[in-house]
C-alpha cells in the first residue's frame, strides 16, 4: 500500500494555519478543489471546497476555513483561522475529478494545536498572531454530493457572504517555499 508523507505544523490556539498546495497548472487550474480532514481509519471528510469551476484568486470562506485558488501559480492556499485545540488532526488538499476518486495534492498536513497564546509568531512562517482579520466578504461554496439521486441541499454556515474582497490578497512573488514531498512506497 502507498504510504503518504506528512508535514507537521505546531500552532497555538488563536493562530492561523496557512498552507499552500500546488498542482499541475494546465491539468487542474479550473477543477474544484477541497480541504479534507482524515478521520480514523483513512476516512477523508470534506470540510470546505472551492466553487465549480474553481475561480482564480477568489476567496471562499466556510466557517474558519478560507480557500484561495491561484491558477497562475498552480496553487491552492488554505487558511484555518482562530485555531482551536479540537482542530488538531490530519488534513489534505484534493482535487475533485468525478467520477474518479479525488486527486490528492502532495503531502498531508499534520496539525497540532496547543493551548496558550504566543504573543509573537514562531519561526514557522505559517503561523500568525492571535488577532486575525477574517475578510468580511468572501464567496461560499458547497461541496458536491457525488452521484446520489437523493441529493440534499445544504444551508451554508451563517458566517459567509457573497462578494470577494481585496483584503485577503497575498504576495506570490516568491513561491519557492512550497514543499514537495514525494509519495513513497
Amino acid at each position: 500500500a502507498t504510504k503518504l508523507t506528512e508535514e507537521k505544523y505546531e500552532l497555538k490556539e488563536g493562530q492561523t494555519l496557512d498552507v499552500k498546495c500546488d498542482y499541475t497548472l494546465e491539468k487542474f487550474a479550473s477543477s474544484q478543489k477541497a480541504w479534507q480532514i482524515i478521520r480514523d481509519g483513512e476516512m477523508p471528510k470534506t470540510l470546505a471546497c472551492t466553487e465549480r469551476p474553481s475561480k482564480n484568486s477568489h476567496p471562499v470562506q466556510v466557517g474558519r476555513i478560507i480557500l484561495e485558488d491561484y491558477h497562475d501559480h498552480g496553487l491552492l492556499r488554505v487558511r484555518m483561522v482562530n485555531l482551536q485545540v479540537e482542530d488538531s488532526g490530519l488534513y489534505q488538499c484534493v482535487i475533485y475529478q468525478p467520477p474518479k476518486e479525488p486527486h490528492m495534492l502532495f503531502d498531508r498536513i499534520r496539525l497540532v494545536v496547543t493551548k496558550g497564546f504566543s504573543g509573537t509568531p514562531g519561526s514557522n512562517e505559517n503561523s500568525t498572531q492571535n488577532v486575525y482579520k477574517i475578510p468580511p466578504t468572501t464567496t461560499k461554496a458547497l461541496c458536491p454530493l457525488y452521484t446520489s439521486p437523493r441529493t440534499v441541499t445544504q444551508a451554508p454556515p451563517k458566517s459567509t457572504a457573497d462578494v470577494s474582497t481585496p483584503d485577503s490578497e497575498i504576495n506570490l512573488t516568491n513561491v519557492t517555499d512550497i514543499i514537495r514531498v514525494p509519495v513513497f512506497n
Epitope: R39, D40, L47, Q84
Partner: antibody, heavy 121, light 112 residues
Framework: QVQLVQSGAEVKKPGASVKVSCKAS????????MHWVRQAPGQGLEWMGI????????SYAQKFQGRVTMTRDTSTSTVYMELSSLRSEDTAVYYC??????????????WGQGTMVTVSS | DIVMTQSPLSLPVTPGEPASISCRSS???????????LDWYLQKPGQSPQLLIY???NRASGVPDRFSGSGSGTDFTLKISRVEAEDVGVYYC?????????FGGGTKVEIK
C-alpha cells in the same frame, strides 16, 4: 432507486460468529462510506464501525475491536460485517447505513432494512 | 467519547400541537467549517431509522417542513411545528463530529 438490502435473520450459539451482508444498488458504491449500527431489543442505536468501500480501510468502535471485521466486495457492491465470539448481549438488529464520502455532511442518508441476529444456546 | 443526552425520554403529544426535543453533547459539535455535526433520525415502529435533519439544521430530502433543527455547539433542539399521527416513533440525535459516532438515548413520541 438507491437501496441497501441486507441478508436474512440469523440464530447463533454463544461463541459462534455471524456474517451479515449489505448489498448496495442505485449509486456509485465506492463514493460512499458504509457504517454498521446495531440495536438491541427495546434499546437505542449503537455505532459499531465504518468501512471505506473504495480502499477497504476500516475504523471500529473500541467496544468491538478484536471481535468485528468489516469487508467489502466491489464487484458485487456488497459490504460485510462479521462479529465473532458471540454472546447473548449481541442479540440485536444490525443495520448498515451509508454516508456520503465526498460531501460535507456525515449523516446516514440511506439505511438497510436490518438483520436480526439472535444469540441463544 | 462524546456523550449525547436527550430529553425528554417520552413525549406524549396532541395532533396539531407543537413538540420539542432537546439534545445535549458533552463536547462542542461545531467544526472549523462552521457546521455543527449533529443529525436527527426518526425510527418509526418496526422500521429502520430515517434521516430527518443533518448538520444541525438542514432538512433531508423529502422531510416535511414541519420539522426543524436548531442549536449550536453543545445544545440542539428538534421541533415539530404541528405533530401529525405519522410522526410517532423514537427520535434520536447523533453526533458525527468525531469517531466513535454516538447517539442520544432516544425520545419516544406518542399520541396522547
Amino acid at each position: 432507486q438507491v437501496q441497501l438490502v441486507q441478508s436474512g435473520a440469523e440464530v447463533k450459539k454463544p461463541g459462534a460468529s455471524v456474517k451479515v451482508s449489505c448489498k448496495a444498488s442505485g449509486y456509485t458504491f465506492t463514493s460512499y462510506y458504509m457504517h454498521w449500527v446495531r440495536q438491541a431489543p427495546g434499546q437505542g442505536l449503537e455505532w459499531m464501525g465504518i468501512i471505506n468501500p473504495s480502499g477497504g480501510s476500516t475504523s471500529y468502535a473500541q467496544k468491538f475491536q478484536g471481535r468485528v471485521t468489516m469487508t467489502r466486495d466491489t464487484s458485487t457492491s456488497t459490504v460485510y460485517m462479521e462479529l465473532s465470539s458471540l454472546r447473548s448481549e449481541d442479540t440485536a438488529v444490525y443495520y448498515c447505513a451509508r454516508e456520503a464520502g465526498y460531501d460535507i455532511s456525515s449523516a446516514f442518508d440511506i439505511w438497510g432494512q436490518g438483520t436480526m441476529v439472535t444469540v441463544s444456546s | 467519547d462524546i456523550v449525547m443526552t436527550q430529553s425528554p425520554l417520552s413525549l406524549p403529544v396532541t395532533p396539531g400541537e407543537p413538540a420539542s426535543i432537546s439534545c445535549r453533547s458533552s463536547q462542542s459539535l461545531l467544526h472549523s467549517n462552521g457546521y455543527n455535526y449533529l443529525d436527527w433520525y426518526l425510527q418509526k415502529p418496526g422500521q429502520s431509522p430515517q434521516l430527518l435533519i443533518y448538520l444541525g439544521s438542514n432538512r433531508a430530502s423529502g422531510v416535511p417542513d414541519r420539522f426543524s433543527g436548531s442549536g449550536s455547539g453543545t445544545d440542539f433542539t428538534l421541533k415539530i411545528s404541528r405533530v401529525e399521527a405519522e410522526d410517532v416513533g423514537v427520535y434520536y440525535c447523533m453526533q458525527a463530529r468525531q469517531a466513535p459516532w454516538t447517539f442520544g438515548g432516544g425520545t419516544k413520541v406518542e399520541i396522547k
